[in-house]
């Protein structure tokens, strides 16, 4: 309704003597700002005066505030929105109705708020979930309809009068909707908490008791059981009797059914609190427990381990592992069902007792072929000795032994021969299935363990074979000792170290890489002519005529090998120089005369120089000197000089005669 002032605040506020009240409040006036505010206690409207009567706890006018009693009551609001109030301390006689008389310029309003002040601090209220089950987390809530800024309080949880370890979360609300203090505690109750008292205690800031609330926990849980057995150690011999009793120590709600379990499986027709076992057998050994159920679920007792003792049963042997590899470790395990466990063992290998072996396990750290055979054992405990079982077979596997490579050929072997070898061995487990040969080659294996080398190479030095089952055993290599003609025969210049110049002392060496047999002979030849029979060919003073193609031969009892032809090159200065003339040494003036410097040189002439009859050098650098047109005064002796990297050579003089042409003679 638009003619009303709008207020928001809690309907009733609760406190106790000496505490305080904080009243959260908001409003909206009909018009303009608040001009006057009076707080009444139990106001009553006086029709005669058209005013409200009652105790004025607080008053505020245009002129300013009227001091209240020691400022016990405070208006914390403003002129348009906030109407929050505080009373501190609050007294029992403050209970009743508070009236907020508000006046603006043209409008008036009376807003009523209930105040409930008790003589003593009122108790908080504990809220529990509808059902509590063991081990399921629940939240306990303690609520107090009180909160005031000027009066701090705390809520503490106690279980059977002892503070609870779990951390509680306390929250406070001081809003226009609600005023309260709340503590929440998360808690996982156990079956043992059933029937226990939980208290929420209200305390002041110093921890002084103010009030409390208590509840008794109703924790739903499965039956809690205890099992008793006769005899108490649950150890009996075959034929004895055993009694087990099941007692319920707690159940909420009451139990409904009883059953017995052996090794987790339910025993049929056993639905009472007592289990009687008569003339037990060893098969009845095991873990027993009783199970009692209620609406929450089944509860189980602790397990009782019933041991029915008996003498060892016939034993079996387990081998880790068979077949075993020679050199590996092997463990034998004697397995025999017995209770109590066997205290002594007797071991047999191929029916013969193994001395000093009395343990359940026999460990052989390094297996050898003679360890193969049948292993059996006998177990013994306080009740007797068992029987020897069938035993277990140990198979010891090993690589082929004493492998040898044997040459079948008559010796010596020559390069190109066909060689046959066989691979022999002494023993093997498992059997030999294949053979290997080293080095690898494109060789023939006509039968298992036989190798045929066609056209044996000079460098087939050694051959080794391996006999293989799961492993390969290699024989020591055998030397074929192949005999062959000298190899890699070549001519090598020993001196001079650099190029050969005419007049040098020259030594050539006939080298070869290998020969078998070692004894060799040498032969030197040039152009099919025998020059010497030493490993070296020597020239005291080499001449250009010694240049040419040289070969050396090396032979032994197997054959002979020739080197590649080696070219001997002799470097020499230009020699045998001569000047040739074209078309001849007599030429008519006006024609062309070509002079050519001919020579023998190694390396070839790199530079030519021409000279006239007065040894004057002519400006030509080529092998040919061309005079065109030639003149009569060019008649004379000419010579040339040739130069290469070794030196110089000069020609003898050659005379050119230039004669007059008929025209010249005619003019004279």
């Amino acid at each position: 309704d638009s003619s009303k002032w709008v207020f928001e605040h809690p309907e009733t506020l609760y406190a106790w003597e000496g505490a305080c009240v904080w009243i959260p409040c908001t409003y909206r006036a009909l018009d303009g700002d608040l001009e006057s505010f009076i707080l009444f206690h139990n106001p009553e409207y006086n029709k005669n005066t058209s005013k409200f009567d009652g105790t004025r706890l607080y008053e505020s006018t245009k002129d300013g505030k009227v001091p209240s009693e020691q400022k016990r009551v405070q208006f914390l609001g403003d002129k348009n929105k906030n109407c929050t109030l505080s009373i501190h301390p609050v007294h029992l006689n403050d209970s009743g109705q508070l009236g907020l008389r508000m006046e603006s310029k043209t409008e008036k309003w009376m807003e009523r708020i209930h105040l409930n002040v008790s003589e003593r601090p009122f108790p908080p209220h504990i809220q529990l979930p509808p059902e509590i089950q063991e081990s399921q987390e629940v939240t306990l809530t303690c609520l107090l309809n009180f909160s005031c800024y000027g009066y701090p309080i705390q809520l503490q949880w106690l279980l059977e009068g002892v503070p609870m370890r779990q951390a509680a979360v306390t929250s406070t609300s001081l809003t226009i909707k609600s005023v309260f203090t709340r503590s929440e505690l998360k808690f996982s109750p156990q079956w043992s908490h059933h029937g226990k008292i939980v208290t929420c205690q209200l305390q002041d800031a110093d921890g002084k008791f103010l009030s409390n609330d208590t509840v008794q926990l109703n924790v739903k849980h499965t039956p809690k059981l205890e099992i008793k057995v006769t005899p108490s150690d649950a150890i009996v011999r075959e034929g004895d009797s055993v009694t087990m009793t099941c007692e319920v120590s707690s159940s909420n709600p009451e139990y409904t059914t009883v059953s017995w379990l052996k090794d987790g499986t339910s025993l049929k027709k056993q639905n009472t609190f007592t289990l009687n076992l008569r003339e037990v057998t060893k098969d009845q050994s095991g873990k027993y427990c009783c199970q009692v159920s209620n609406d929450v679920g089944p509860g189980r007792s602790e397990e009782v381990f019933l041991q029915v003792q008996y003498a060892p049963e016939p034993s079996t042997v387990q081998i880790l592992h068979s077949p075993a590899v020679e050199g590996s470790q092997v463990e034998f395990l004697c397995m025999s069902l017995a209770n109590p466990l066997p205290t002594n063992y007797t071991w047999y290998h191929n029916g013969k007792e193994m001395q000093g072996r009395t343990e359940e396990k026999v460990h052989i750290p390094k297996i050898l072929p003679w360890h193969a055979g049948t292993y059996s054992c006998v177990a013994e405990n306080i009740l007797g000795t068992g029987q020897r079982g069938p035993g277990a077979e140990l198979d010891v596997q090993y690589p082929p032994k004493k492998v040898t490579t044997v040459i079948q050929n008559p010796m010596p072997i020559r390069e190109g021969d066909t060689v046959t070898l066989s691979c022999n061995y002494n023993s093997s487990n498992p059997s030999v299935t294949r053979y290997e040969w080293k080095p690898h080659g494109a060789w023939e294996e006509p039968s298992l363990g036989v190798l045929k080398i066609q056209n044996v190479g000079w460098d087939n030095t050694t051959i080794a074979c391996a006999a293989c089952n799961s492993w390969c055993s290699w024989a020591s290599p055998v030397a074929l000792n192949v005999q062959y003609a000298p190899r890699d025969v070549r001519v090598r210049k020993i001196k001079p170290l650099s190029e050969i110049h005419s007049g040098n002392s020259v030594s050539l060496q006939c080298d070869f890489s290998s020969s078998h047999p070692k004894e060799v002979q040498f032969f030197w030849e040039k152009n099919g002519r025998l020059l010497g029979k030493e490993s070296q060919l020597n020239f005291d003073s080499i001449s250009p005529e010694d240049a040419g193609s040289y070969s050396c031969w090396v032979n032994n009892s197997i054959g002979q090998t020739a080197s590649k032809a080696w070219t001997l090159e002799v470097l020499y200065a230009p020699r045998r120089l001569r000047v040739s003339m074209s078309p001849g040494d007599q030429v008519m003036e006006g024609k062309s005369a070509t002079l050519t410097c001919e020579s023998d040189a190694n390396p070839p002439v790199s530079h030519y120089t021409w000279f006239d009859w007065n040894n004057q050098s002519l400006p030509y650098h080529s092998q040919k000197l061309r005079l065109e047109p030639v003149k009569v005064q060019h008649s004379g002796a000419y010579w040339c000089q040739g130069t290469n990297s070794v030196g110089k050579g000069r020609s003898p003089l050659s005379t050119l005669t230039v004669y007059y042409s008929p025209e010249t003679i005619g003019r004279r």
């Epitope: 650098h621 005079l627 060019h634």
Partner: antibody, heavy 127, light 112 residues
Framework: EVQLQQSGPGLVKPSQTLSLTCAIS??????????WNWIRQSPSRGLEWLGR?????????DYASSVRGRVSINVDTSKNQYSLQLNAVTPEDTGVYYC?????????????????WGQGTMVTVSS | QSALTQPASASGSPGQSVTISCTGT?????????VSWYQQHPGKAPKLMIY???NRPSGVSNRFSGSKSGNTASLTISGLQAEDEADYYC???????????FGTGTQLTVLL
Amino acid sequence: EVQLQQSGPGLVKPSQTLSLTCAISGDSMLSNSDTWNWIRQSPSRGLEWLGRTYHRSTWYDDYASSVRGRVSINVDTSKNQYSLQLNAVTPEDTGVYYCARVRLQDGNSWSDAFDVWGQGTMVTVSS
Amino acid sequence: QSALTQPASASGSPGQSVTISCTGTSSDVGGYNYVSWYQQHPGKAPKLMIYDVSNRPSGVSNRFSGSKSGNTASLTISGLQAEDEADYYCSSYTSSSTLYVFGTGTQLTVLL
């Protein structure tokens, strides 16, 4: 300092004879380590060696195959000069003509380069 | 007798190096160590810069150097200067009756 001074007409009619002279100062034509050369330059043919003369025990001359038969080099030792005669000229013979020396000895070793040049004469063959 | 082959043009900035090649045959460049290099400014006579492959006449800057490999000769100008802008010609003695052959010429531009 060796200098070569060229002289001769700049315009020659086709089929006539081109005649140029090169006067030498600072060196003798009779030197037995020099040769005396004629070279021409034209946009179409570039630099082209035409011929040379030199004196050792007598006078010698050499000519390029491209002009051999219509070229001659004459010497006047009294004036220490040499000349080029090129007969039967055509417009193809238009270009700048240079005389140049080659000194063949550089210390004890042989050498061969045009180390001194004349100033050049622009010759145009045109009717 | 064919002329020796040179690149038509070459260029470089001041301070840089430039190399000009001259390719002939075994009858000229490859056969003799008588290769020479000439510098020619417009309207002027050629000037000898390098003779006998790698020798420098007195008065020529040591920025100019020559070399030869097989049938190809080279002229290298280091630390280029503006005054190096000119035409460059190579020449070689030859075994033919035309005793000397020249290169086609290279125009060198100095980029300023």
